[in-house]
């Protein structure tokens, strides 16, 4: 409705005598702003005077004047939306209505609320969840219909009477629409914690007592059980009785059914408290526990090891590992069933005792072959001896022993020869299944263990076979010793140095790379004519007229081999020298004369210089000079001069003879 | 100090004769160590040689080959100088003209002189 | 005729900088090979003869090398006064001929 005033706080407030109450409002006046303000104490409307009676606990007016009691109430609002008033220390009189009288400019207005001041701190609300189980996490809540912030206060977690170690939550609301202050703690109470007492408790800022709340938790858990056995120890020997019993510690809700189970396993027709086992036989060892059921689920006892002994049963022996390779170690283990177990051993190799060997395992560091066969064992504990098993084999493998590699053929052997190799060996186990030879190459292998090398090569100096099964055992090389030709057979220049200039001293090396048989002859040739028997070649002074393509040969008993043709090289400065004229020594004026440098030179000639019959050089370096148009003073002796990197040359004159042509005769 | 110094005229009609001369101071056009040679330049055809006078116990001419037909060299012992005569020009001659000493490469040049072959 | 070949016909460089320009013979010139400069307007400056001989008064970061058909022309520290055209020339027969030239530039 619009002609109303609009407010906003909790409908009732609680405290108790000597604390205080803080009273969260808002409002909204129907027009302008608040002018005067009365809080009044179970306020009554007087007909009479258009006025409310009662106890004014607070006043403000227009001229901001406050009674001096007042001090104990504080209006803490304002004139247009804060009505929020606090009351310090409140008594256990003021229960009852608060009346705010609001008056602005031109509208009234009486707000109610209701205040519950108790004489004692009431007790704060402990809320559970609807159902507990064990090890399931919980909240505990506890709630009281209190805050102030002039009265601090504290909720304390209590079970049995002990303070929880568990952090607790606190929290508290002051608003329009709430007050009250919470503890919250999560828990994950166990089976013992059923039927506890937990308490909240309210206290004061210095810890002290003020009330509380308290409830019995109830835990719904599985059957907590104990089981009891006759012999207490467990053990016994087979023909024996044995007693079980199952207790049951707590159960919420109430058990419903009982089990027995072995290893695990339910045990069928075993539904009571107590389970009986007459003449025990050894498969009736274990572990055994009992289960109980209830409505939450199944609970079990602890396992009680049921031990019956006997004497050992016949043994069997493992080996780690066959077949064994020589070199290894191997270990047998003794297996015999036997409660208690075995304290002394006998083994057997081969049917023989091994003697000083007891323990359950026997462990060889490095096998060799002689340790092959078969091993077996006898265990024995306190009940008796066991028998001997069928025992197991050892197989001891190892590559080929001894291998050798044998040539065939008559000895020597000589390049391009068929030569046949055998592989021999020893022992081998397992079997020899292929051969390896070393170097490898394009061979024949007619049978296993033969190797035939057909065209057998200078240069086969070794050969080396291994006998494989599963490793591959290598020959010691046996020597070819093939006997073959000169090899590699070259000419070379072992002086000068350099290059070879006309007039040196020339050696030339015939040179091998190798020869068996070592004696050997040599041959040089230069155009088919022999020329020495040395393996050097010597030139005192060498000459042009010596260049040309020379061979040498090197011969020993298996026959002989030529180099390669090696061209010698002389070089010499340009020499026979001459002019050459075209087209001849005698030209007409006016026409043209070439003259050419003719030359023999190694290296050829580089430049040429040309020179007339006072020795005057002309600006020319080419072979040719060419003379165009030549004049009748161009006439006499020309020579030329050529030079190459040896040194220079020179010809001999050569005259040029220039004639008037008949217009110059006809002019004359 | 050596110096060559062109003269000649620069402006030739096409067909007529091309005529330079190159004054030789500091050294003999009769030296027997130098040839004394012309040498043109045009943007078409870069730098061309065209022909060299030179003397040793006598007078020698070479001449290129492009233009055999047409030159003549000349040396001048009185005024210590030598000439070019180009015949039957053509707006082709059109070029720069240099005379130049050759001792051991072209070391002295004349300052060059711009004929132009127009009608 | 002998064809001279220069490489490059043009190259750009900055002062200091080392530069090199080549030239090949069509046929075997022995070492009567010069090297000449020319700036715009002026005759060509001889700088090395005979492939590998400083002319007198040309500075001594100019040098030649090479014989028979291949040259080169190495200005070791390029100074502001040197970008011209470059041109090399075979002195072994008639008729002489030039190499196309080679235009040193600013970079």
């Known amino acids: 409705d619009s002609s109303k005033w609009v407010f906003e706080h909790p409908e009732t407030l609680y405290a108790w005598e000597g604390a205080c109450v803080w009273i969260p409002c808002t409002y909204r006046a129907l027009d302008g702003d608040l002018e005067s303000f009365i809080l009044f104490h179970n306020p009554e409307y007087n007909k009479n005077t258009s006025k409310f009676d009662g106890t004014r606990l607070y006043e403000s007016t227009k001229d901001g004047k406050v009674p001096s009691e007042q001090k104990r109430v504080q209006f803490l609002g304002d004139k247009n939306k804060n009505c929020t008033l606090s009351i310090h220390p409140v008594h256990l009189n003021d229960s009852g209505q608060l009346g705010l009288r609001m008056e602005s400019k031109t509208e009234k207005w009486m707000e109610r609320i209701h205040l519950n001041v108790s004489e004692r701190p009431f007790p704060p609300h402990i809320q559970l969840p609807p159902e507990i189980q064990e090890s399931q996490e919980v909240t505990l809540t506890c709630l009281l219909n209190f805050s102030c912030y002039g009265y601090p206060i504290q909720l304390q977690w209590l079970l049995e009477g002990v303070p929880m170690r568990q952090a607790a939550v606190t929290s508290t609301s002051l608003t329009i629409k709430s007050v009250f202050t919470r503890s919250e703690l999560k828990f994950s109470p166990q089976w013992s914690h059923h039927g506890k007492i937990v308490t909240c408790q309210l206290q004061d800022a210095d810890g002290k007592f003020l009330s509380n709340d308290t409830v019995q938790l109830n835990v719904k858990h599985t059957p907590k059980l104990e089981i009891k056995v006759t012999p207490s120890d467990a053990i016994v020997r087979e023909g024996d009785s044995v007693t079980m019993t199952c207790e049951v510690s707590s159960s919420n809700p109430e058990y419903t059914t009982v089990s027995w189970l072995k290893d695990g396993t339910s045990l069928k027709k075993q539904n009571t408290f107590t389970l009986n086992l007459r003449e025990v036989t050894k498969d009736q060892s274990g572990k055994y526990c009992c289960q109980v059921s209830n409505d939450v689920g199944p609970g079990r006892s602890e396992e009680v090891f049921l031990q019956v002994q006997y004497a050992p049963e016949p043994s069997t022996v493992q080996i780690l590992h066959s077949p064994a390779v020589e070199g290894s170690q191997v270990e047998f283990l003794c297996m015999s069933l036997a409660n208690p177990l075995p304290t002394n051993y006998t083994w057997y190799h081969n049917g023989k005792e091994m003697q000083g060997r007891t323990e359950e395992k026997v462990h060889i560091p490095k096998i060799l072959p002689w340790h092959a066969g078969t091993y077996s064992c006898v265990a024995e504990n306190i009940l008796g001896t066991g028998q001997r098993g069928p025992g197991a084999e050892l197989d001891v493998q190892y590559p080929p022993k001894k291998v050798t590699t044998v040539i065939q053929n008559p000895m020597p052997i000589r390049e391009g020869d068929t030569v046949t190799l055998s592989c021999n060996y020893n022992s081998s186990n397992p079997s020899v299944t292929r051969y390896e030879w070393k170097p490898h190459g394009a061979w024949e292998e007619p049978s296993l263990g033969v190797l035939k090398i057909q065209n057998v090569g200078w240069d086969n100096t070794t050969i080396a076979c291994a006998a494989c099964n599963s490793w591959c055992s290598w020959a010691s090389p046996v020597a070819l010793n093939v006997q073959y030709a000169p090899r590699d057979v070259r000419v070379r220049k072992i002086k000068p140095l350099s290059e070879i200039h006309s007039g040196n001293s020339v050696s030339l090396q015939c040179d091998f790379s190798s020869s068996h048989p070592k004696e050997v002859q040599f041959f040089w040739e230069k155009n088919g004519r022999l020329l020495g028997k040395e393996s050097q070649l010597n030139f005192d002074s060498i000459s042009p007229e010596d260049a040309g393509s020379y061979s040498c040969w090197v011969n020993n008993s298996i026959g002989q081999t030529a180099s390669k043709a090696w061209t010698l090289e002389v070089l010499y400065a340009p020499r026979r020298l001459r002019v050459s004229m075209s087209p001849g020594d005698q030209v007409m004026e006016g026409k043209s004369a070439t003259l050419t440098c003719e030359s023999d030179a190694n290296p050829p000639v580089s430049h040429y210089t040309w020179f007339d019959w006072n020795n005057q050089s002309l600006p020319y370096h080419s072979q040719k000079l060419r003379l165009e148009p030549v004049k009748v003073q161009h006439s006499g002796a020309y020579w030329c001069q050529g030079t190459n990197s040896v040194g220079k040359g020179r010809s001999p004159l050569s005259t040029l003879t220039v004639y008037y042509s008949p217009e110059t005769i006809g002019r004359r | 100090q050596v110096q060559l110094q062109q003269s000649g005229p620069g402006l030739v009609k096409p067909s007529q004769t091309l005529s330079l001369t190159c004054a030789i101071s500091g050294d003999s056009v009769s030296s027997n160590s130098a040839a004394w040679n012309w040498i043109r330049q045009s943007p078409s055809r870069g730098l061309e040689w065209l022909g060299r006078t030179y003397y040793r116990s006598a007078w020698y001419n070479d001449y290129a080959v492009s233009v055999k037909s047409r030159i003549t060299i000349n040396p001048d012992t009185s005024k210590n100088q030598f000439s070019l005569q180009l015949s039957s020009v053509t707006p082709e001659d059109t070029a720069v003209y240099y005379c130049?000493?050759?001792?051991?490469?072209?070391?002295?040049w004349g300052q060059g002189t711009l004929v132009t072959v127009s009608g | 005729d002998i064809v001279m070949t220069q490489t490059p016909s043009s190259l750009s460089a900055s002062v200091g900088d080392r530069v090199t320009i080549t030239c090949r013979a069509s046929q075997s010139i022995s070492s009567y090979l010069n090297w000449y400069q020319q700036k715009p307007g002026k005759a060509p400056k001889l700088l090395i003869y005979a492939a590998s001989s400083l002319q007198s008064g040309v500075p001594s970061r100019f040098s030649g090398s090479g014989s028979g058909t291949d040259f080169t022309l190495t200005i070791s520290s390029l100074q502001p006064e040197d970008f011209a055209t470059y041109y090399c020339?075979?002195?072994?027969?008639?008729?002489?001929?030039f190499g196309q030239g080679t235009r040193l530039e600013i970079k």
């Open positions: 020339q075979q002195s072994y027969s008639t008729p002489i001929t």
């Open positions: 130049a000493r050759d001792v051991e490469g072209f070391d002295y």
